[in-house]
Interface confidence: low
């Protein structure tokens, strides 16, 4: 006869490991007992359990409560055992020794491999700001046994770098994603993908990119200078910009205080019925935590009694 077993048994951390050992004998042969031992190189043999055809299963104290026979029905020639709730320390070489009648003793070895699936973590880098050079967007770390694979899934252009730290029974892999921040990256997902033989499917963690920026400011409302005449109602200037975080707006007048009756409503400057005292240089100041921008315009209120046309200067400055 001969013993049937596996070269390698692979199990995920916390699962039960079936250690197979089946005697394929000739007609009339019987199995008397099966002894299981752990036989890691250089450490001698450590008994797990003894399976006796008459007296049943005896488990050594070190494995009390963790070694069982597979559930019935059982074949008397099957010496397989279950190792409950496998932990990393269980990884190693195991031997089954089978005593048969009348053929004598047989032995076989197998290796138990315990997979430790990773629990990945994604850490965003420092705040991203337009105008920065190559900057860390996020790092992703996963530790497991064997070492997990860490990659990135995104349509954002960037570069990756990985490093690995080996521990006694596992390895930690960290991958960093660097990019040159631009406002077009706002809202784009950056996904860390972790692959590992102990996972049924890849684990994915998504981070949404946020890039601080502030667009140039401009002022609308003076496109038709002929509308800015004495007595006109509803005249207004609107300051245009865009930013992340959303910017705040402030209005001042360069050549004096804002005239009475002029209303500031965020990005909009509203005028009462126009008089010549509303002529002047108005400045929109846009700012967020990232930057600030100014745009100024010259308002020249026309007197319908006068024929001379006036010019409008538009100046934008940072």
């Amino acid at each position: 006869g001969e013993l049937e077993t596996s070269d390698v048994v692979t199990v995920v951390l916390g699962q039960d490991a079936k250690l197979p050992c089946f005697y394929r004998g000739d007609s009339g042969e019987q199995v008397g007992q099966v002894a299981w031992a752990r036989v890691d190189a250089g450490e001698g043999a450590q008994e797990l359990a003894l399976l006796h055809s008459k007296y049943g299963l005896h488990v050594s104290p070190a494995y009390e409560g963790r070694v069982e026979q597979p559930p019935p029905p059982r074949n008397p020639l099957d010496g397989s055992v279950l190792l409950r709730n496998a932990v990393q320390a269980d990884e190693g070489e195991y031997e089954c020794r089978v005593s048969t009648f009348p053929a004598g003793s047989f032995q076989a070895r197998l290796r138990l491999r315990v997979l430790v699936p990773p629990l990945p973590s994604l850490n965003p880098g420092p705040a991203l700001e337009e105008g920065q050079g190559l900057t860390l967007a996020a790092s992703c770390t996963a530790e497991g046994s064997p070492a997990p694979s860490v990659t990135w899934d995104t349509e954002v252009k960037g570069t990756t770098s990985s490093r690995s730290f080996k521990h006694s029974r596992s390895a930690a892999v960290t991958s960093e994603f660097h990019l040159v921040p631009s406002r077009s990256m706002n809202g784009q997902p950056l996904t860390c993908v972790v692959s590992h033989p102990g996972l049924l499917q890849d684990q994915r963690i998504t981070h949404i990119l946020h890039v601080s920026f502030l667009a140039e400011a401009s002022v609308r409302g003076l496109e038709d200078q002929n509308l800015w005449h004495i007595g006109r109602e509803g005249a207004m200037l609107k300051c245009l910009s865009e930013g992340q975080p959303p910017p705040s707006y402030n209005w001042t007048r360069l050549d004096g205080p804002l005239p009475s009756g002029v209303r500031v409503d965020g990005d909009t400057l509203g005028f009462p019925p126009l008089t010549t005292e509303h002529s002047g240089i108005y400045v929109c100041h846009v700012s967020n935590e990232f930057s600030s921008r100014d745009s100024q315009v010259t308002v020249d209120v026309l007197d319908p009694q006068e024929d001379s046309g006036k010019q409008v200067d538009l100046v934008s400055a940072s």
Partner: antibody
């Protein structure tokens, strides 16, 4: 073929919370975002927000204080909640799928929600 | 937010006509623009993404062009099933849609 199906009450009272569900079938939503977009009767389209299969969300800043999107990946179901509704929230609400960029290759058929007392 | 201005808001055309719809962004959106077709009572259907790429299953009479702020959707030879409303949409940051262009039968 990927299919999206919106469901939920067609009538919501003012000041209450609108709740809709989008069920995705016929394909995996891993790597994809599920978006909510609405269209008031006779008007244009407005993007409300997105949730990714990993749970990350991104909302329209103009509605951020009122919108919550969540996911039950085991059921491939995505939920929209819009609080403190008014008549201006009356619209056809669509869910749609996108890849990593926010353009929408698959849409649900839409569900009309009317806000009225 | 970035504003998307579509023109014209409506147009009348005949089968076989060449139709052009334009969309202007209030600032550069690079090539981050999509076009959709919507028929009454139906959801929008993706026609073009990334300004110039035809979506799967869309007839070749549709084409998109442009980058930066100015974009165009062209139907080279209008077919009966093309009478619908067309929307542009940018996907640069918070998405916004154009106001729509209704293509009607002349």
């Amino acid at each position: 073929q990927v299919q999206l199906q919106e469901s939920g009450p067609g009538l919501v009272k003012p000041s209450e919370t609108l709740s809709l569900t989008c069920t995705v079938s016929g394909g995996s939503i891993t790597n994809y975002g599920v978006h909510w977009i609405r269209q008031p009767p006779g008007k244009g389209l407005e993007w409300l927000g997105v949730i990714w299969s990993g749970g990350s969300t991104d909302y329209n800043p103009s509605l951020k204080s009122r919108v919550t999107i969540s996911v039950d990946t085991s059921k491939n179901q995505f939920s929209l909640k819009l609080s403190s509704v008014t008549a201006a929230d009356t619209a056809v609400y669509y869910c749609a799928r996108s890849g990593k960029w926010y353009y929408f290759d698959y849409w649900g058929q839409g569900t009309l929600v009317t806000v009225s007392s | 937010d970035i504003q998307m201005t579509q023109s014209p808001s409506s147009l009348s055309a005949s089968v076989g006509d060449r139709v052009t719809i334009t969309c202007r962004a209030s600032q550069s959106i690079y090539s981050n623009l999509a076009w959709y077709q919507q028929k009454p009572g139906k959801a929008p259907k993706l026609l073009v993404y990334a300004a110039t790429n035809l979506a799967s299953g869309v007839p070749s009479r549709f084409s998109g062009s442009g980058s930066g702020t100015d974009f165009t959707l062209t139907i080279s030879s209008l077919q009966p099933e093309d009478f619908a409303t067309y929307y542009c949409q940018h996907f640069w940051g918070t998405p916004t849609f154009g106001g729509g262009t209704k293509v009607e039968i002349k």
